[in-house]
Interface confidence: medium
């Protein structure tokens, strides 16, 4: 999946399988990623868990789960809020759209998360303060969260090279450069850069990201997916001047 | 499976709160064809549900019994008539320390705010 | 086979709480809503309300509203029922019912009761 | 919160019908989908007889029967039999208005 890390970097890892996304000493989170085709190193969202801990007279430890096709309004304990506490409708589940879109407000926490289903998979968007971000009592371990970190350096794909490569040659895949030998043949660029253009006019690395999608799964469902992201953006990103990123490196993780 | 979603949504949009759509009105229909969509989404992962084929029957049914036609407008989920325990707004009396903002403003300006997201493939 | 069992027979003093459990088993807990209904002795069935195990949702009888609170747990496949302030009037037989499926609201399958008798 | 009112009681020889009525409000009743019928036997649990008016659950016996007509609801039982001796009770699913009748004793002779 592509990851916007909390320092606004951009990045397309190949992580497979659970990896955690943040860890802090208030919530964890873990996604749980698959390859999008047989064969294919890239990677989407097949399962997402939050796990709140166990707050003061807030909230008791709750723990929320989304799979494919599978996007509950409630914690795994059925509730939607909290917990019995005092302060248990400082953490809120709110469902947006029916099986689509949901939020989950920890006020406690100042954070807001976003989790929605596009197409089989799902996206994660969350809005924090810096000193929960930064609430880590064991940096060794938890201090590796994706969010923070980023991806290790060979879990990335470089798809501007990718991006490059087909432009260059239209619809056909360059070995070296391809994450998806197997993808299907049938998604020309032409078109993946009309689709893209139609949901995200501004040609920043979110644009970048729904040509390299099209190009490797022949699914217009990421589209969809890199739109929602950047609406995510728009809404949680506290920088208005940051919504778009444009330049962008092979990043070293940390 | 999420059937049970699907029949509180119909038990509530006909359940006489907020002027009914009562079994012979044109909002009858339209929220039995919200019910039957929502069932539809559903329908993947509800194989072998019993709860969920006897909604798709019992819409049938509806749809036969009060002259329904398949297509045309559907109805907006309404809201439950009482609010859940909970899932009220957030409690007068709940606790400063549960409210990050409102603590932080004690001894500090505006938090800064991060983001991270993940998307696609 | 589909059945609702529930927790035992319980004294409470008047300003106390209870809270009763009913388990399911043989059918989709998530499926299927469950009321709460209690019968004082001698007298008529009382609907108390009931709750969406699939989402939380829940819906009071107006006149408990406050003083009664609908949970379940999902992975024991297990709903409650927590009455908070009792009094003398509150001594009843409270049974669960597993809500029937499709889009017609009745009770379907029902718990054996469970006894709660408040007395100081 | 309306009522729903039924008799206290309504008796009848084995082989006999008996009517049960359940009388509401349009919103309780009259427009509701959701009328559905108890039988509870003494220290047992209710156990549902009858849901939308008329529909019948597997394993309950077809002298059973319910129709509506305005406002009231009722439960028929044709062929009265010394097991049907019990008190019945008339739900309506409805929102604010969610209610069981007061109940109705029925006899058999």
């Known amino acids: 999946p592509h990851l916007r890390t909390f320092t606004d970097r951009f990045q397309t890892c190949k992580v497979q399988g659970a990896w955690p996304l943040i860890d802090n000493n208030y919530l964890n989170v873990q996604v749980t990623n698959t390859p999008v085709l047989p064969g294919s190193a890239a990677t989407a969202t097949s399962k997402l868990t939050i796990i709140f801990k166990n707050f003061q007279e807030c909230v008791d430890q709750k723990v929320y789960q989304a799979e494919m096709d599978e996007l509950p309004a409630a914690f795994v304990d059925g509730s939607k809020n909290g917990g019995d506490k005092h302060g248990a409708n400082s953490l809120k589940i709110t469902e947006k759209v029916s099986g689509q879109h949901v939020e989950i407000q920890a006020k406690y926490i100042g954070t807001t998360i976003v989790v929605r289903q596009v197409g089989r998979y799902l996206t994660f968007a969350v809005r924090m303060p810096e000193e929960v971000v930064n609430a880590v009592e064991d940096w060794d371990s938890q201090g590796l969260y994706l969010c923070l970190r980023g991806c290790p350096l060979n879990q990335q794909i470089d798809f501007q090279a990718f991006h490059t490569n087909a432009e260059g040659t239209g619809a056909r895949r360059l070995a070296a450069a391809s994450p998806a030998p197997t993808a299907p043949e049938t998604f020309p660029y032409e078109t993946a850069v009309a689709k893209c253009k139609e949901k995200l006019p501004v040609e920043d690395l979110y644009y970048q990201a729904c040509v390299f999608d099209l190009l490797t799964t022949g699914d217009v469902n990421f589209t969809l997916a890199a739109y929602y992201a950047l609406e995510d953006v728009k809404m949680l990103h506290s920088n208005k001047d940051k919504l778009h990123l444009y330049e962008r490196t092979r990043d070293l993780p940390g | 499976c999420k059937i049970l979603k699907c029949n509180s949504e119909f038990w509530s949009a006909t359940s006489g709160s907020h002027a009914p759509a009562s079994d012979d009105t044109p909002e009858f229909c339209a929220a039995l064809r919200s019910y039957a969509l929502c069932t539809r989404r559903t329908a993947r992962t509800c194989r072998g549900d019993l709860a969920y084929h006897s909604a798709v029957h019992g819409i049938e049914d509806l749809m036969s019994q009060h002259n329904c036609s398949k297509d045309g407008p559907t109805s907006q989920p309404r809201l439950r008539t009482l609010p859940p325990a909970g899932d009220s707004q957030e409690r007068s009396d709940s606790p400063e320390i549960c409210h990050y903002e409102k603590s932080f403003h004690k001894h500090s300006a505006t938090p800064n705010y991060t983001h991270c997201g993940l998307f696609g493939d | 086979e589909v059945q609702l069992v529930q927790s035992g027979a319980e004294v409470k003093k008047p300003g106390a709480s209870v809270k009763v459990s009913c388990k399911a088993s043989?059918?989709?807990?998530?499926?299927?809503?469950i009321s709460w209904v209690r019968q004082a002795p001698g007298q008529g069935l009382d609907w108390m309300g009931w709750?969406?195990?699939?989402?939380?949702?829940?819906n009071y009888a107006q006149k408990l509203q406050g003083r009664v609170t609908m949970t379940t747990d999902t992975s024991t496949s297990t709903a409650y029922m927590e009455l908070s302030s009792l009094r003398s009037e509150d001594t009843a037989v409270y049974y669960c019912?597993?809500?029937?499926?499709?889009?017609?609201?009745?009770?379907?399958?029902w718990g054996q009761g469970t006894l709660v008798t408040v007395s100081s | 919160q309306s009522a729903l009112t039924q008799p206290r009681s309504v008796s009848g020889s084995p082989g006999q019908s008996v009517t049960i009525s359940c009388t509401g409000t349009?919103?309780?009743?009259?427009?509701?989908?959701?009328v559905s019928w108890y039988q509870q036997h003494p220290g047992k649990a209710p156990k549902l007889m009858l849901y939308d008016v008329t529909k019948r659950p597997s394993g309950v016996p077809d002298r059973f029967s319910g129709s509506k007509s305005g406002n009231t609801a009722s439960l028929t039982i044709s062929g009265l039999q010394a097991e049907d001796e019990a008190d019945y009770y008339c739900f309506s699913y409805a929102g604010t208005d969610t209610l069981f009748g007061g109940g109705t004793k029925v006899t058999v002779l």
């Open positions: 043989g059918y989709t807990f998530t499926s299927h809503g």
């Open positions: 019912a597993r809500v029937g499926s499709g889009p017609y609201y009745y009770m379907d399958v």
């Open positions: 349009s919103s309780s009743v009259g427009d509701s989908i959701y």
């Open positions: 709750i969406s195990p699939y989402s939380g949702n829940t």
